[in-house]
Each structure stands twice: as structure tokens, then as C-alpha cells.
């Protein structure tokens, strides 16, 4: 369908704009310009803009969305949007969400099956263990930062945080009441779905029924399926299935290739959707701002809480995570972050880690040189279990509520908050109604009132976006760290531990290790056995 890219005199494919607006192929220096933005001459500036077109469009879309939202909500009068008009206004954004959600299921399943099948079990185990360790440590650090910031800034003790108009009955009705044990049992049940088809759109959740048993009313747990993809179950199944396919040896080869091809086709769709992302993001952000009734009052009342959350997310995302990345890789973390601006902005716009997953995969592979078998194995797991942003927000919220209700927090309680926030953020993907329910679990664990959860919900639309950005950033940096780990271990050992994803070109040739520094260049042996022919992954856009 797509013609071979033109070749220059050295036999390398000429620079072509890729689906995400970056350069599919360029010299190392040009890649530097694309990622880091060193644009000198007019020609370089033009190339730089072209390389970063989608990134710039996405950033502009967020800013334009805020401006549009404020403009529409400020205009009022004839422009005032009722619920029916609002849904039409947000429609382009809704379309983006639907497109991304459409892609999630085949992407997660196929990429994980392909990823797990392309790694030998030992390497898979090591990679998974390092990934989980990274996710756990960073989540714990985020939790500690959240608690520390909230104790220092005291958002709940600020007079503006609450006022007399906040009803005494707060939100007892809004606060989900669920036993901590049942929440974690639901998590375990969702890891092992009883029906794979229904796991694609339903999760298991425990509710309660009051029954009269010998004259006493007893709360009996009742299991039921609730709306919402059981992503955790699908992730676990896909990994195990991938390992099983690898165990089959030659018999499983065909199916592995099928899943890899399916994955490649899905990524082609992603590359098309990416160009629509800025439009969708703009309307999602604008729609949310229009929807908010009194943003000013909300900020006046909860300003310090919002500041605490956003500041925590900024410190963790711009200092802590990059520092960890730098310490382990000795590479510029901000260049890495520049390469994933589009998915980060998409995360802000969609407020969904899984919806951002397709774009993140594409960007870390094409802009940041993360190998496919790593990104497609690590990122879906990260999107499911790595929630630094959520853990940080929950810790801030717990301390905020403690301060708001003048409840003391001793050392034991603070440790309990840290541990519970870390554990429940890891399990949040397996718990339907994630954020608020996991916050309720933390509050229950330290005997804090759940009444003020309604205050947290009031600004969740903003804080949750910030959470999502941090969550997906953590996933991407984790993938980058693991790529570095793999590079180091492979350069030390003579035999590579990891085999390439098998469907990158026609079925016959096996690739030799990729050229250092440019993961987008793959050298394959030509018909005559020479290794001079360079092939580029087809750029569809």
C-alpha cells in the first residue's frame, strides 16, 4: 500500500515525517533537533517544526481548549450551553475517546501476547520484576511526597478550604462503603476472569444486601458484574497466554505472528488517530471547563488542596521521576519527556491512562528508541498497575481530610496511609469505581471521616487529569529505564536474552541487533547476504 521511502546515496531511507509528526529516520544530530529542539538555521527550524508538528498542535490544543472553555462559560447569554448543547459541543472530544477506547482491547491483548511471546521466560521474569520494582518504588515515593506536602502546606487547615455553606451532612451518601477485604478480594477475582469475553467490558464487584438472619439484620456480600473493562484480567491472561505460545515452540509461531501483525495493524490505526488527537483534546478540555458551574468559588474554597495535588504532581513528574531516570541511564530525561508530549497532553485531555496507551506506545518507540518488545510488554502493565499520580493525590486527600476534620495523624497512621495508598493505587485498575473507592479504603484504614469525599469529588475533574499525566509519564520512564537495562545486559552478554518481535518484516529474515543510537534503523541481510540494505518501518502517514 505504501511505497518504499526514497533512499539517499548511503542507502539509508531519507527522512520522512512519521505518524506522530516526528522524523522516522534522521541522523543522530537531526534526532537531537527533533527531540531536544536545537533549531539553528531556517532550514533546521522548518525541519524542527515539521518534526514536532504534532507535539506543537497538541500543546496548542490544550491551551486553546482552556481558552475556548473559559470563553464559552464566560460569554453566557446566547452562548450558554444546556446539557443537550453541551453534549454536542463536547462531541469531537467524545469521538477521540471512543476511537482510543476502540483500540485499547486489541492493542493491550495483542501487544502483551506478542511481547510476552517474544521474550524468553527468564528475561520476561527479570523484566517484569524490575518493572514492578520500579513501579512500586516510584508509587511509594509519590505517596511519601503527597503526605509530606500536605503536612507542610496544611491544605485542610486553611480557612478557605471549607466554609459554613458546606452542609454538615457532607456526602455520607456519596461515599462508597465497602470492606477493605472485599475490595482486595475483588481485585484478586478480577485478575482471574471467569469469562474472557465479558472481561472486555465488565468487571467483578462486591455489593451488599441486608438480610434478616435470626432476627438480626446482617450485611451479606453479594458478587455482581459491573460495567467497565476488566483490564487487569486481560493483562494477566495475555501475558500468560504469550508465555504459553512461546512454550509451544514452532507450533505457536504462526499465532505469535498473527498477534504481532494484528498489533502492527492496530498501531497503523493509532498513527491515524494521533492526528485527530489535538482536535479531540481541545474540545474535551473546553467541555470540562464549560461544565464546571463555579470554578472561581471552587478554587477559593479548595485552592490549597488543588495546589498541593498539582504541586506534588509537578515535583514528582518534573524532578523525582526524571532524577531516577537520569541516575540509572545517565541520559537527559527532559529529552525523553519531550518525545512523549503528545501522549502526555492526551492524558490530560482524556483523563484516561488506558486511552493514552496507544499513543504512548507509538511515541516511546518512534521518538525515544524503546524497543517494541519492551514498550508493548511494559506499557500495558504500567497503565494497569503504576499509578503514582493516584497514590499522591490519595495521600494528599487523606491528610487534607484529617486536617479538615481535626483528626490527628500519628506516625503509625501516616505509614498506614502510605502503604494503603500504594497498595490500593496498584489495585485500582481491578477495583471498579477506582479513585473514590480507593480513597474511601484509605480513610477507613485510618478511621478518618468519609464525609468530605464530596469536596474531593468537586475538583476531581482537574486533579484526576494531573494524576493521569503523572501515571502515564511514570509508565513511559519505566519503559525507558528498562530499555537501558536491556541495552546494558545485552552489551555485557554475548547472546542476547531478548529476541525481536517477529513480525517487523516479511516472515523469513531474522534481524541482527539494531544499530546503536538509532532504534528506528533496522539492518537486514539483503538477497545476496550483504547487510548494507537498511529498511525502515513503514510510515503510513
Amino acid at each position: 500500500m505504501v511505497a518504499d521511502p526514497p533512499r539517499d546515496s548511503k542507502g539509508l531511507a531519507a527522512a520522512e515525517p512519521t505518524a506522530n509528526g516526528g522524523l522516522a529516520l534522521a541522523s543522530i544530530e537531526d534526532q537531537g533537533a527533533a527531540a531536544g529542539g536545537y533549531c539553528g538555521s531556517r532550514d533546521q527550524v522548518r525541519r524542527c517544526l515539521r518534526a514536532n508538528l504534532l507535539v506543537l498542535l497538541t500543546v496548542v490544543a490544550v491551551v486553546a481548549g482552556v481558552a475556548l472553555g473559559l470563553g464559552v462559560s464566560g460569554a453566557g447569554g446566547a452562548l450558554a450551553l444546556g446539557p443537550e448543547r453541551l453534549s454536542a459541543f463536547v462531541f469531537p472530544g467524545e469521538l477521540l475517546l471512543r476511537l482510543l477506547r476502540m483500540i485499547i482491547l486489541p492493542l493491550v491483548v495483542c501487544s502483551l501476547i506478542g511481547g510476552a511471546a517474544s521474550l524468553d521466560p527468564g528475561a520476561l521474569g527479570r523484566l517484569g520484576a524490575w518493572a514492578l520494582l520500579f513501579f512500586l518504588v516510584t508509587t511509594l515515593l509519590a505517596s511519601a511526597l503527597g503526605v509530606g506536602l500536605a503536612l507542610a502546606l496544611q491544605p485542610g487547615a486553611a480557612s478557605a478550604a471549607i466554609n459554613a455553606s458546606v452542609g454538615a451532612a457532607g456526602s455520607a451518601e456519596n461515599a462508597p462503603s465497602k470492606e477493605v477485604l472485599d475490595s482486595f478480594l475483588d481485585l484478586a477475582r478480577n485478575i482471574f476472569p471467569s469469562n474472557l469475553v465479558s472481561a472486555a467490558f465488565r468487571s467483578y464487584s462486591t455489593t451488599y444486601e441486608e438480610r434478616n438472619i435470626t432476627g438480626t439484620r446482617v450485611k451479606v456480600p453479594v458478587g455482581q458484574e459491573v460495567e467497565g473493562m476488566n483490564i487487569l484480567g486481560l493483562v494477566v491472561f495475555a501475558i500468560v497466554f504469550g508465555v504459553a505460545l512461546r512454550k509451544l515452540g514452532p507450533e505457536g509461531e504462526l499465532l505469535i505472528r498473527f498477534f504481532n501483525s494484528f498489533n502492527e495493524a492496530t498501531m497503523v490505526l493509532v498513527s491515524w488517530i494521533m492526528w485527530y488527537a489535538p482536535v479531540g483534546i481541545m474540545f474535551l478540555v473546553a467541555g470540562k471547563i464549560v461544565e464546571m458551574e463555579d470554578v472561581g468559588l471552587l478554587f477559593a474554597r479548595l485552592g490549597k488542596y488543588i495546589l498541593c495535588c498539582l504541586l506534588g504532581h509537578a515535583i514528582h513528574g518534573l524532578l523525582v521521576l526524571p532524577l531516577i531516570y537520569f541516575l540509572f541511564t545517565r541520559k537527559n530525561p527532559y529529552r525523553f519527556l519531550w518525545g512523549i508530549v503528545t501522549p502526555l497532553a492526551t492524558a490530560f485531555g482524556t483523563s484516561s491512562s488506558s486511552a493514552t496507551l496507544p499513543l504512548m506506545m507509538k511515541c516511546v518507540e518512534e521518538n525515544n528508541g524503546v524497543a517494541k518488545h519492551i514498550s508493548r510488554f511494559i506499557l500495558p502493565i504500567g497503565a494497569t498497575v503504576n499509578m503514582d499520580g493516584a497514590a499522591l493525590f490519595q495521600c494528599v486527600a487523606a491528610v487534607f481530610i484529617a486536617q479538615l476534620s481535626q483528626q490527628s495523624l500519628d506516625f503509625v497512621k501516616i505509614i498506614t496511609i502510605l502503604v494503603t495508598a500504594t497498595a490500593s493505587s496498584v489495585g485500582a485498575a481491578g477495583i471498579p469505581a477506582g479513585g473514590v473507592l480507593t480513597l474511601a479504603i484509605i480513610l477507613e484504614a485510618v478511621n478518618l471521616p468519609v464525609d468530605h469525599i464530596s469536596l474531593i469529588l468537586a475538583v476531581d475533574w482537574l486533579v484526576d487529569r494531573s494524576c493521569t499525566v503523572l501515571n502515564v509519564e511514570g509508565d513511559a520512564l519505566g519503559a525507558g529505564l528498562l530499555q537501558n537495562y536491556v541495552d546494558r545486559t545485552e552489551s555485557r552478554s554475548t547472546e542476547p536474552e531478548l529476541i525481536q518481535v517477529k513480525s517487523e518484516l516479511p516472515l523469513d529474515p531474522l534481524p541482527v541487533p539494531t544499530e546503536e543510537g538509532n532504534p528506528l534503523l533496522k539492518h537486514y541481510r539483503g538477497p545476496a547476504g550483504d547487510a548494507t540494505v537498511a529498511s525502515e518501518k513503514e510510515s503510513v502517514m
Epitope: S159, I162, N163, A172, Q403, Q406, Q407, S408, E444, L448
Partner: antibody
């Protein structure tokens, strides 16, 4: 030891204002919330609301919004309950009660109570 | 608001008796149940918080139990100073609500 000492009984005409005080001692005043509880003659206890003693922010129960005002003077560790315009149904004993800083909402120390009688 | 229902509303007992007062909440209050004792013309005194924890200075003959919506206060051996009115109170959600009281009298 921890003590909450309330002002003496009050006899008021309908429409008059009243201010009841509650002086705390034996603990750090701004660490614990202060609640107010009403007990009408021969009746049970009714929670009126509480005041955040650190932030000075009051929270009122649904039946006590409007004429009732909770305030503080942290320099003398004292909480106040003010009723702007008393009515006959305000006749009751009013207790200040220290809100515990643990296990959500309970009251570990109480003032002796201030009896308010509203009569024309 | 959560309704609290105490039973019985009054009871007569003799010194040394074992007495049980029950309290039922209109919804699950997750053990945030507290008990107070009030004598005529006096302020209430906290006896038990969080279902079963004895407040400092409260004699060990007082004990509490229960879960979900049903809770009990037990006095293992009645003493002369125990004759008073007892209130239960839920501290699960705002507003905190009290039971109507149980008056314990000498038989």
C-alpha cells in the same frame, strides 16, 4: 486535667441575643474541634455543629443554620455560641463538647452545660 | 441522617445485676458507636468509643460490643453510681446522632 467550663444560666426574652462561652484548659485548644450539643428539657441530645479550632471555620447542623454562630478566641482558649434572636424553642441546656481527634465523631470531654430559658 | 434506636427506653435493675442496653442504627455504622452516661442536671460522660474501647477512668465493668447496625452496652455488675441515663451515638458520618436514651433505675 482537661476541663471545659461554661458560662452561667441565661434568661432571655424572645428576640434578644445571647452568647454562651466555653473555656478550655488542660490541653492545646487548637488541636481539637469543639462541638455544641443541645438538650431540650426532658429530651435527648442533639448535635448542633462544630468549629474547627485551628482554622476558625464553623460547620452547622441542618437545623442550626441562620441564627446560630460559633466563634473562637484562641488567645484565651474559649469557644462561643451566639444565638442572634432567641425563640421559645431555644429553651434548653447547651453543652460544649471537645471532639476527639480520633475515630471520627465522638466527644470525650464535656462542659457542665448552660441553661437558656426563653420567656416573655 | 442516620437514626439511632435504643432499647429499652427504661429498665429497672438491682445492685449486682448484669444489664444490657441495645442500640440499632438505620444503616451500617462500621463500629463508630459510642456510649455516654448522664446523670440528672449533669453533663454526659463518655464511657465507650468505637464500639468497645473504654475511655480513660471508666470502670472495667462497662463493656461494649456489636457490628454493622446492632450494638450493645453491658454493665457486668451494677453499682449504685451506675443508675443514670445512657445514650448511644453514631460517629460514622455527619451529623453525629444520638439515641433517645435508656433510663436505668433501681428496682
Amino acid at each position: 486535667q482537661i476541663q471545659l467550663v461554661q458560662s452561667g444560666p441565661e434568661l432571655k426574652k424572645p428576640g434578644a441575643p445571647v452568647k454562651i462561652s466555653c473555656k478550655a484548659s488542660g490541653y492545646t485548644f487548637t488541636t481539637f474541634g469543639m462541638s455544641w450539643v443541645k438538650q431540650a428539657p426532658g429530651q435527648g441530645l442533639k448535635w448542633m455543629g462544630w468549629i474547627h479550632t485551628y482554622a476558625g471555620v464553623p460547620i452547622y447542623g441542618d437545623d442550626f443554620k441562620g441564627r446560630f454562630v460559633f466563634s473562637l478566641d484562641t488567645s484565651v482558649s474559649t469557644a462561643y455560641l451566639q444565638i442572634s434572636s432567641v425563640k421559645a424553642e431555644d429553651t434548653a441546656t447547651y453543652f460544649c463538647a471537645r471532639r476527639s481527634d480520633n475515630y471520627r465523631y465522638f466527644f470525650d470531654y464535656w462542659g457542665q452545660g448552660t441553661t437558656l430559658t426563653v420567656s416573655s | 441522617d442516620i437514626q439511632m434506636t435504643q432499647s429499652p427506653s427504661s429498665l429497672s435493675a438491682s445492685l449486682g445485676d448484669r444489664v444490657t442496653i441495645t442500640c440499632r442504627a438505620s444503616q451500617d455504622i462500621r463500629n463508630y458507636l459510642n456510649w455516654y452516661q448522664q446523670k440528672p442536671g449533669k453533663a454526659p460522660k463518655l464511657l465507650i468509643y468505637y464500639t468497645s474501647r473504654l475511655h480513660s477512668g471508666v470502670p472495667s465493668r462497662f463493656s461494649g460490643s456489636g457490628s454493622g447496625t446492632d450494638y450493645t452496652l453491658t454493665i457486668s455488675s451494677l453499682q449504685p453510681e451506675d443508675f443514670a441515663t445512657y445514650f448511644c451515638q453514631q460517629g460514622h458520618t455527619l451529623p453525629p446522632t444520638f439515641g433517645q436514651g435508656t433510663k436505668l433505675e433501681i428496682k
